[in-house]
């Protein structure tokens, strides 16, 4: 913490301007009034403060607003945002997308994924839901940031907004997030024709259940392996060799190069070797001929 001293009369600060860059840390602490700083935050980013000086300014704002900064201050943080921790940001209430845009721009090129994720979370909470304008802002200024939201937050996305989400925005989404988004996407695209529907739903398929994947296999979609490998393991395991062949079409050859990777490996282990051989890919590891498969999990459930 910066030590307290009294401000020399000639150093008294009446406005936030460039003369402050010549102030030592202790002089800034003693001479800058926190309320004045908050009122003139829009000037701070234009002044080339050192990181040490920014630490002092942050300390002053923290003292003035122990419960979290108001949005009028947050909007003008500029490079001071780089000094914020996720704990600081968690105290904020942000509703303006202009504020979000301004801070996303500042964070670009800096290692601030935790801070940005917390900021986006606060915006969604502040606005009450993940509406189209918020999604548009995220896709424009922070591709991939949508996936920083928790499944709980993503559940507030109305299906009507799903169309604004691009494949690259889902690139870092995990299974739990896709589990939430997939049913919304299915609803949003339900009136589209087969091929158009597949193009739209494809980025969300990591959340699809087996029955939907089986249904796709009847529609000549020729799913590529990049999409197939993103399907839930639980959705892939019940598929028959014939269904996978129909689902992948000409891409079925790609199973060979992925045969050691999940979910392909796990799927191979559940197929009869005879059936795998019909693909002519040399896939190995299926259940040998003449073996009886007992599903013990079913027996346990019955007993």
């Amino acid at each position: 913490d910066v030590e307290r001293t009294t401000c020399p009369p000639e150093k008294e600060v009446h406005e936030i301007d460039e003369s402050l860059i010549f102030y030592k840390k202790r002089e800034l602490e003693a001479c800058v009034d926190a309320a004045l700083l908050a009122a003139q935050m829009d000037r701070v980013d234009a002044i080339p403060f050192t990181y040490e000086q920014l630490d002092v300014l942050k300390h002053k704002l923290d003292e003035l607003y122990p419960q979290g900064y108001p949005e009028s201050v947050i909007r003008h943080l500029g490079h001071l945002f780089l000094k914020m921790s996720p704990e600081d940001i968690r105290k904020w209430n942000v509703t303006s997308l202009e504020t979000l845009k301004a801070l996303l721009k500042v964070s670009k090129g800096h290692e601030m994924s935790a801070q940005v994720a917390t900021l986006i979370d606060r915006v969604v909470v502040g606005r009450g839901q993940l509406d189209k304008d918020t999604v548009d802002t995220l896709t424009a200024f922070c591709p991939g940031c949508l996936c920083s939201l928790s499944p709980e937050r993503l559940s507030s996305v109305p299906p009507s907004v799903i169309g604004a989400v691009r494949p690259q925005d889902l690139d870092t989404c995990g299974p739990r997030q896709l589990d939430v988004l997939y049913p919304k996407a299915r609803l949003a695209f339900q009136n589209m024709s087969g091929s158009e529907y597949f193009v739209k739903i494809r980025p969300f398929l990591g959340g699809a259940p087996t029955e939907d994947v089986k249904a796709l296999s009847q529609q000549n979609v020729s799913m590529d392996l990049a999409t197939f490998m993103k399907l839930r393991r639980e959705a892939v395991l019940p598929l028959t060799v014939a269904e996978v062949q129909k689902l992948l079409g000409p891409h079925v050859e790609g199973l060979k190069v992925e045969e050691q990777h999940s979910p392909v490996r796990d799927w191979i282990l559940k197929q009869r070797q005879d059936d795998l051989d019909t693909l002519g890919l040399g896939l190995q590891g299926g259940i040998p001929n003449g073996y009886l498969i007992l599903d013990l999990s079913v027996r346990e459930a019955l007993s």
Partner: antibody
């Protein structure tokens, strides 16, 4: 423009470990496996293993089991290879390369990281 | 594992000369799974030929590839100075993926 960016040369002591990053840009990270290849003193190439960014599941050439650990961080589109218990035999250039899921061959390579193990 | 043996290890060719590099596999491969890479000193390898006979993007038409089973080749119909490099064959027919020892092609 597809890019796989690797870190600069590393000089490490025998017995130590090293972690080499490979940052991807210009393509959908989760549509490609990241493979790692070793090249000793300008000679032939040896496949170390590959990692799938969707599952973080890695497959290794048995020769490198226990020597190399392959991981990914999808949030930063970066793959990592950690090499441990280093000896002079590990002195080589290490390349990362991308391979589209379901396809063979490596259509884009990193510039290589030169690792020198010496006391 | 599948061992790939390339020959010759080093060769020199004059501009305009036809050059043939061979790659032998210790067990039969599906031709789709045989690739070739070009590497110049101080650079990364570049995908050159895929699935035995398909030229990668930007590869001059004087290059060609052929083969099946255990025997594969890369041919330069008319050697040019920029073709001086090392060429590696590579299989992904079975784990672990393997590379040949390489052929270094020099210009006379």
């Amino acid at each position: 423009d597809v890019q796989l960016q690797q870190s600069g040369p590393e000089l490490v002591e025998p017995g130590a470990s090293v972690r080499i990053p490979c940052k991807a840009a210009g393509h959908t990270f989760t549509d490609y496996n990241v493979d790692w290849v070793k090249q000793s003193h300008g000679q032939s190439l040896e496949w170390i293993g590959d990692v799938n960014p969707n599952t973080d599941g890695a497959i290794y050439n048995q020769k490198f089991e226990g020597k190399a650990t392959l991981t990914v961080d999808t949030s930063s589109s970066t793959a990592y290879m950690e090499l441990r218990s280093l000896t002079s035999e590990d002195t080589a250039v290490y390349f990362c390369a991308r391979r589209r899921l379901g396809q063979g061959g490596f259509d884009s390579w990193g510039q290589g990281t030169t690792l020198t193990v010496s006391s | 594992q599948v061992v790939l043996t390339q020959s010759p290890a080093i060769m020199s060719a004059s501009p305009g000369e036809k050059v043939t590099l061979t790659c032998g596999a210790s067990s039969s491969l599906i031709s789709k799974y045989l690739y070739w890479y070009q590497q110049k000193p101080g650079s990364s390898p570049k995908l050159w030929i895929y699935s035995t006979s398909n030229l990668a993007s930007g590869v001059p038409a004087r290059f060609s590839g052929s083969g099946s089973g255990t025997s594969y080749s890369l041919t330069i119909s008319s050697m040019e100075a920029e073709d001086a490099a090392s060429y590696f064959c590579h299989q992904w027919s079975s784990y672990p993926y393997t590379f040949g020892g390489g052929t270094k092609v020099e210009i006379k």
